[in-house]
Interface confidence: low
């Protein structure tokens, strides 16, 4: 029986009965928040072999192993992941081992096993046999291995039953529990699965099979399942569904999508039966099961019952996410907020058309209206008193409307009104008149030349860069010394810079009046020598990364109608030099014959330039005789191995560890102080842990149903 679309077992352990007849869970499996320790021994689900999404275990009291619950769980496909993970075991207070002795494959995603105080048998599992890449696995905060004394079957009797593999240069037995080995297939099978008797399965099988070389005997399919057979691709007139099986059109037509979305049924697109058209596509008619590409952003019409939608917070803006046409009026009143510009862009950035009017008032948190980055038409079908369809009043920090060089905005009907926007230059308003086609509609009092721009540098001169020099992580720039009418009024310069993969940034991107700014800022004092050009060294930059840079002069002078005269540069785009790439990731090697090694790896996370080739070096190594000198299966303390440089694991030091020379010949040494990079890595690690934990809590704690 296929169960789904996701099974959430919480609070009452007897809910586990829901899994009784499941062979495949099409979706996720959550087992969580069971606070009363129960006896799980009577619960056993041998039918369950595949979970198509992920398995999450969280705070289940009394559960000591998963092996009895899911003795035949073979594959977790990871079609959808929980925060990049296909297996999450978190804060399982009584779990002693994972014990999923038949788990052979996690197709996509990593594992996260964290804060399980009693959990052992983690170092005895070779996850590289189950996952393609182990570098993203996160296994921390569990029972320290030294307190575990993990022993694989037979090692105490000196008749080891399990096979060995190498993990982190340690060649050891691999097992799930004290009596269950980790299954490995003969090397002759290559990437193929195998039966319990070590016969190779059909190439289309995944995990295991009940008979060799038979595509109808697979426990799970490598690609897709159709009519009892594992197939590399879905046959004609069938469609991929949920990442693992093939269904026909009739099946797809009769699935209704989840209640709270627009339930128009599933669609068939690109050979797949899916809940809705993918990004960039739209249904070919409301009753259609097929998708066609959108021209530009896909249209989504949003309507406000009360005609006027007030945007006074991120929450209210959230309601407009994805909307391209807004039927009604927008009243924007953002007095404060955190990271408001980018949040508003996130939720309102797709709006192209407003059918009524747009009013922006008392929005002291706004520096620019660029968050409405796709607005191209205000129809003005409904107007404010006085026939205004664009009304901007009392916005103390508004400096820019839009970047008019890259913006086409039409106001079809109605006038514009601007008053009490002290940082908004009148020239900016006049430019809007021209672009929007409203020039001549406004009467004299509609654009107040006294109280708009009264506290802004409206008459800007252009600062010119004179030189730029780059290295892998530095940029040196200089610019002409700016001379205002009275040079004593030039206070300093401010340099703004940020990463800019594309040459499309504007001065006001991500900027609001509450401190959020996507630009890094550096103040540059005037050189004391009047003949020296001002400049700056920007350091700590990333190699082979394009940065956008501009400079502003900070001045005092009040001239011409009491307006401040200032100066700023154009935005300069400049790329740092290439550098040595970081190390290639997930290096795996396997022997496929007595004279060949197959080596695979993933590209480095930081290429720091255009990668042109890889260098692979290898050398023959002698067998390490040291491995044979100690009985590793005994529970005695393993002797400390003296490494060539005299350093040892800091935890092994019991005598006085202090020596004057770190790493010298005098014996054990102190831990060297942490480098800045290590401290930063630790900080990021702690931050990442917090982010994950927040994500976990937000995902699983839900209000009680009615």
């Amino acid at each position: 029986e296929i169960c789904g679309p996701g099974i959430d077992i919480r609070n009452d352990y007897q809910q586990l009965k829901r899994l009784e007849n499941c062979t495949v869970i099409e979706g996720y499996l959550h087992i969580l928040l069971i606070s009363k320790a129960e006896d799980y021994r009577s619960y056993r689900f041998p039918k369950l072999t595949v979970i198509t999404e992920y398995l999450l275990l969280f705070r289940v009291a009394g559960l000591e192993s998963l092996g009895d619950l899911f003795p035949n769980l073979t594959v977790i496909r990871g079609w959808k992941l929980f925060y990049n993970y296909a297996l999450v075991i978190f804060e399982m207070t009584n779990l002693k081992d994972i014990g999923l002795y038949n788990l052979r494959n996690i197709t996509r995603g990593a594992i996260r096993i964290e804060k399980n105080a009693d959990l052992c048998y983690l170092s005895t599992v070779d996850w590289s046999l189950i996952l393609d890449a182990v570098s993203n696995n996160y296994i921390v905060g569990n029972k320290p291995p030294k307190e575990c004394g993990d022993l694989c079957p037979g090692t105490m009797e000196e008749k080891p039953m399990c096979e060995k593999t190498t993990i982190n240069n340690e060649y050891n037995y691999r097992c799930w529990t004290t009596n269950r080995c980790q299954k490995m297939c003969p090397s002759t099978c290559g990437k193929r699965a195998c039966t319990e008797n070590n016969e190779c399965c059909h190439p289309e099988c995944l995990g295991s099979c009940s008979a060799p070389d038979n595509d109808t005997a697979c426990v799970a399919c490598r690609h897709y399942y159709y009519a009892g057979v594992c197939v590399p691709a879905c046959p004609p007139n069938t469609y991929r569904f949920e990442g693992w099986r093939c269904v026909d059109r009739d099946f797809c037509a009769n699935i209704l999508s989840a209640e709270s979305s627009d339930s128009e049924g599933f669609v068939i697109h690109d050979g797949e039966c899916m809940q809705e058209c993918p990004s960039g596509f739209i249904r070919n008619g409301s009753q259609s099961m097929y998708c066609i590409p959108c021209e530009g952003p896909c249209p989504k019409v949003c309507e406000e019952e009360k005609k006027t939608k007030t945007i006074d917070s991120v929450t209210s803006a959230q309601m407009l996410q994805g909307c391209t046409i807004f039927k009604g009026n927008l009243l924007i009143n953002i007095r404060r907020g955190n990271n408001i510009a980018s949040e508003l862009e996130n939720f309102m950035g797709l709006i192209e058309v407003v059918t009524g009017y747009v009013k922006i008032r008392h929005s002291h948190a706004l520096v620019s209206l660029s968050f409405l980055k796709n607005l191209r038409l205000i129809l003005g079908e409904e107007q404010l008193e006085g026939n205004y369809s664009f009304y901007v009043l009392d916005n103390q920090n508004l400096q820019q409307l839009w970047d008019w060089d890259h913006r086409n905005l039409t106001i079809k009907a109605g006038k514009m009104y601007f008053a009490f926007n002290p940082k908004l230059c009148v020239s900016e308003i006049y430019r809007m008149e021209e672009v929007t086609g409203t020039k001549g509609r406004q009467s004299k009092g509609d654009i107040n030349t006294r109280n708009n721009g009264e506290r802004a540098s409206c008459e800007s001169d252009v600062l010119h860069f004179t030189s730029t020099t780059t290295s892998k992580n530095r940029i040196i720039i200089t610019w002409h010394r700016y001379r205002p009418p009275d040079y004593r009024d030039l206070i300093s310069f401010t340099v703004y810079y940020k990463e800019a993969p594309f040459k499309n940034v504007t001065e006001y991107d991500g900027q609001d009046a509450c401190g959020s700014n996507s630009w890094n800022m550096v103040d540059v004092d005037l050189p004391p020598n009047k003949d020296v050009e001002p400049g700056i060294l920007l350091h700590g930059l990333k190699p082979w990364t394009q940065y956008a840079v501009y400079v502003k002069a900070v001045t005092l002078t009040m001239v011409e109608n009491d307006h401040i005269r200032g100066a700023k540069s154009e935005i300069l785009y400049i790329r740092t030099n290439a550098s040595v790439p970081s190390i290639p990731l997930d290096v795996l090697s396997a022997s496929n014959s007595s004279s060949q090694l197959i080596v695979k790896w993933n590209p480095p996370s930081l290429p720091n330039g255009n990668l042109s080739y890889y260098i692979v070096r290898w050398q023959r190594q002698p067998q390490d005789g040291y491995l044979y000198r100690h009985n590793y299966c005994s529970k005695d303390k393993i002797p400390i191995r003296k490494y060539a440089d005299g350093t040892i694991d800091i935890e092994e030091v019991t005598e006085n560890p202090k020596t004057e020379v770190c790493g010298g010949e005098k014996g054990p040494c102190c831990a060297c102080p942490k480098t800045e990079a290590e401290k930063q890595a630790e900080k990021e690690e702690a931050e990442y842990r917090k982010v994950f934990e927040n994500f976990l809590h937000n995902s699983i704690f839900v209000p009680r149903p009615e």
Epitope: E1, C3, G4, P5, N21, E26, D250, A253, N254, I255, L256, S257, A258, E259, S260, S261, D262, S263, E264, E706
Partner: antibody, heavy 121, light 107 residues
């Protein structure tokens, strides 16, 4: 508690129109689909269709396309069934039923008490 | 449309009896079978969905089974409140269709 309260019985003449209401209480109307089911005297049920209470989009079974209209008044947490141009065959009890989406299917976990419509000249 | 057939339109049973009601679909409905109970006063209640899953609050004496086209509802240890009409409904293919019903009467 969760319940669907339907309007009272109706006696109509052929050719007239009837509008039946179904008021939801104890839950948010927009979170669940609302279905309409017909039961002729002494017969089984016939599913007439459903309305997506989130979007207001109705879906009608082929047999009930044309004269039948599903609608909503979200602010009043009420769903309506309108039957135009009544005929004797429309004599039946009409149930509203809240549906739960279950893995590609839909089942009806809360039912109204039914509204009896009698069409007679 | 998929036809749902409840071959027995009525059956008589005594308190404490075990009763099985069958339902056949005109084609495979992939276990998407639901059972409802209608009391003599007309009130309808959901009993079982997806062939065998007991709706919350339904007594455990009700159980469902079947696959493909043949399904059944079993009531063990029949109680007074169980005398009613039982309908099956398929949820595999639109339009959803119901059986004609099986009335369980007191012997």
């Amino acid at each position: 508690q969760i319940q669907l309260v339907q309007s009272g019985p109706e006696l109509k003449k052929p050719g007239e129109t009837v509008k039946i209401s179904c008021k939801a209480s104890g839950y948010t109307l927009a979170n669940y689909g609302m279905n309409w089911v017909k039961q002729a005297p002494g017969k089984g049920f016939k599913w007439m269709g459903w309305i997506n209470t989130n979007t207001g989009k109705p879906t009608y079974s082929d047999e009930f396309k044309g004269r039948f209209v599903f609608s909503l008044e979200t602010s009043a947490s009420t769903a309506y069934l309108l039957i135009n141009n009544l005929s004797n065959e429309d004599t039946a009890t009409y149930f509203c039923a809240r549906s739960i989406y279950y893995y590609g299917s839909r089942y009806f976990n809360v039912w109204g008490a039914g509204t009896t419509v009698t069409v007679s000249s | 449309d998929i036809q749902m057939t409840q071959s027995t339109s009525s059956l008589s049973a005594s308190l404490g009896d075990r009763v099985t009601i069958s339902c056949r679909a005109s084609q495979d409905i992939n276990n998407y079978l639901t059972w409802y109970q209608q009391k003599p006063d007309g009130t309808v209640k959901l009993l079982i969905y997806y062939t065998s899953r007991l709706h919350s609050g339904v007594p455990s004496r009700f159980s469902g089974s079947g696959s493909g086209t043949d399904y059944s509802l079993t009531i063990t240890n029949l109680e007074q409140e169980d005398f009613a009409t039982y309908f099956c409904q398929q949820g595999n293919t639109l339009p959803w269709t119901f059986g004609e019903g099986t009335k369980v009467e007191i012997k």
